[in-house]
Amino acid sequence: LKGQEFAPSHQQVYAPLRADGDKPRAHLTVVRQTPTQHFKNQFPALHWEHELGLAFTKNRMNYTNKFLLIPESGDYFIYSQVTFRGMTSECSEIRQAGRPNKPDSITVVITKVTDSYPEPTQLLMGTKSVCEVGSNWFQPIYLGAMFSLQEGDKLMVNVSDISLVDYTKEDKTFFGAFLL
Amino acid sequence: LKGQEFAPSHQQVYAPLRADGDKPRAHLTVVRQTPTQHFKNQFPALHWEHELGLAFTKNRMNYTNKFLLIPESGDYFIYSQVTFRGMTSECSEIRQAGRPNKPDSITVVITKVTDSYPEPTQLLMGTKSVCEVGSNWFQPIYLGAMFSLQEGDKLMVNVSDISLVDYTKEDKTFFGAFLL
Amino acid sequence: LKGQEFAPSHQQVYAPLRADGDKPRAHLTVVRQTPTQHFKNQFPALHWEHELGLAFTKNRMNYTNKFLLIPESGDYFIYSQVTFRGMTSECSEIRQAGRPNKPDSITVVITKVTDSYPEPTQLLMGTKSVCEVGSNWFQPIYLGAMFSLQEGDKLMVNVSDISLVDYTKEDKTFFGAFLL
């Protein structure tokens, strides 16, 4: 076959060659969150900036209403960082009061919604107990990994408590994906 | 062009096909930091090992004096981990003395300097309050994301306190970038 | 010097073109760990799920007995997250008892074993002191970077204490690699 002449002998080319600059890609950055209704026992989804500053979507990767829309099947690297900040967690207050010491926690989940499966799939989770001594605390949770996605899949970032998300700077809280 | 004949109809190839092994890439590892003058209100930049051990630069991605130099415009994945270590933070001392409890913090920033914008751009920031009970503490901050960079851009890693950086092992503190 | 401008000669193809969908890739997810013998002063290696749920291996990237096997030389992005959880660390108990305050710690290491070198190489390490106030704590350590690997190299993830690894969910603890 023409086009396979460059392939090293140990490897057959089954997939079309394609220019890297043409692959779906997105990097989304934090915006101030407007309180939205979310269902009980379901973490709220963050919404994002998709075109100002460092944010962009390209090559048919689109962002709409909290979701990154996957335009083409393939293996994607997906990542997010959420920076949380808060006042002293109840944990230490409870501790001082001698009550059971269940720590507070902060959690980030990257979730896939797909037509071919009725329930959302949790792709990545970062979860951390927060039991800080200081009166003000802040810390990031970073996630990133590769997943096989289908055209039409939707990705979102859910957090345990939207009010603790640091939305002040685009470099602190972000979400991205690119086709490998 | 030969090699483009397999392209699926939904996708025009606007960019030239190029061999993956020819793309600019670098992985830099920590070295002992020599105290350098840095200007007020500016976090100091780390310098790096670029050729010994696990470190390398290739395909026109060069390292010089704290900077990774971007040789070609495109979308890059950029990452860094900095491991910090220190003695008990002042935070807990302040707390014990009954004074206002402003926590210490550790911060990593990946910064872009570009000639198309007059001030450095903070691409990624990881910042964490440190208010440890233990007498010695250590922890990493990891960052990674994709950005559109221009030929001639320069990347550096800045930290809030260079004296807290663990420079003892190349696998603990590192900085890298590769063209997607 | 004029000759120091970036020449547009970067569009020459020096290496064979190859289809992206044909590259070695794997994403492995946590399973319950069976206690295994490990040598003194050597962190135990995790074993992984490689085909159920979110896990997969493809294009000659194979998983066997705790190791990812690298089928082709090149530059790989390697990543892992391990979520740890435990009861109050001894650190705070020791502190309360007035004994020397050496903090407990949690550590993840991504290790390469290669035929061409007698000792394993630590590629990435994430290590964190754990000195929690709360009675139950949990937190992730994330690592990711690019390395030049040789055909036949083997990758594994080692942890400081296998009993602290959260094996309950595939999105909390994972390990992956892909050829760039």
Epitope: - | H38, A45, T64, L69, V113, E119, P120, K154 | L1
Partner: antibody, heavy 116, light 106 residues
């Protein structure tokens, strides 16, 4: 305090090479980019080119590229401009400019007259 | 080259007046810069990234716009604002300036 100081001969003969040096202080030379901009009498501003002191990489205005060379000496914190084959049309105030770190800083300018 | 067309080339206004200068790029640019140059002096950066005020610049100066059309405004002209104002784009090679707008007091 950030300072840029241009220096060089104020008079250059036609067909000769104009040479100017910019000495910088008060900031980390490598952290920025250094440009040369000129302003001919009664005219607007014209960007000539820039150098990245960290790498030595340069970019030039295509209209001047065949005649202009910008170099740097990091040990002296200096950037130099050379413009060859000058004519009377090259008579101008030449400015050295820092970019990449706010504030954007300009030297006070150096008037160069091309005349026989 | 990206051509920068600045208008007007000169204007005369009274102290306290609102003054507006426009700059049109021949193709879209992400960032626009505005400089002030007083006679015999080097240009001084006033606005960067289309709308960010440089340090130490009075708040009566502002910038706006995106793509190809940008505006520079002095909300209340002061006697010390007598100068020539230039727009500049940094993205194309070469960097190009507008031809300048000379601002005078009536």
């Amino acid at each position: 305090q950030v300072q840029l100081q241009e220096s060089g001969p104020g008079l250059v003969r036609p067909s000769q090479t104009l040479s100017l040096t910019c000495t910088v202080s008060g900031f980390d030379f490598d952290d920025t980019y250094m440009h040369w901009v000129r302003q001919r009498p009664g005219r607007g501003l014209e960007w000539m080119g820039r150098i990245d002191p960290a790498s030595g990489h340069t970019k030039y205005n295509p209209s001047l590229k065949s005649r202009v060379t910008i170099t740097r000496d990091t040990s002296k914190n200096q950037v130099s401009l050379r413009l060859s084959s000058v004519t009377a049309a090259d008579t101008a105030v030449y400015y050295c400019v820092r970019s990449g770190g706010l504030p954007d800083v300009w030297g006070q300018g150096s008037l160069v007259t091309v005349s026989s | 080259d990206i051509q920068m067309t600045q208008s007007p080339s000169s204007l005369s206004a009274s102290v306290g007046d609102r003054v507006t200068i426009t700059c049109r790029a021949s193709q879209g640019v992400e960032y626009m810069y505005w400089y002030q140059q007083k006679p015999g002096k080097a240009p001084k950066l006033l606005i960067y990234g289309a709308s960010n005020l440089a340090s130490g610049v009075p708040s009566r100066f502002s910038g706006s716009g995106s793509g190809t059309d940008f505006t520079f405004t002095i909300s209340s002209l002061q006697p010390e604002d007598i100068a020539t104002y230039y727009c500049q784009q940094w993205e194309g090679n070469p960097r190009t300036f507008g031809q300048g707008t000379k601002v005078e007091i009536k």
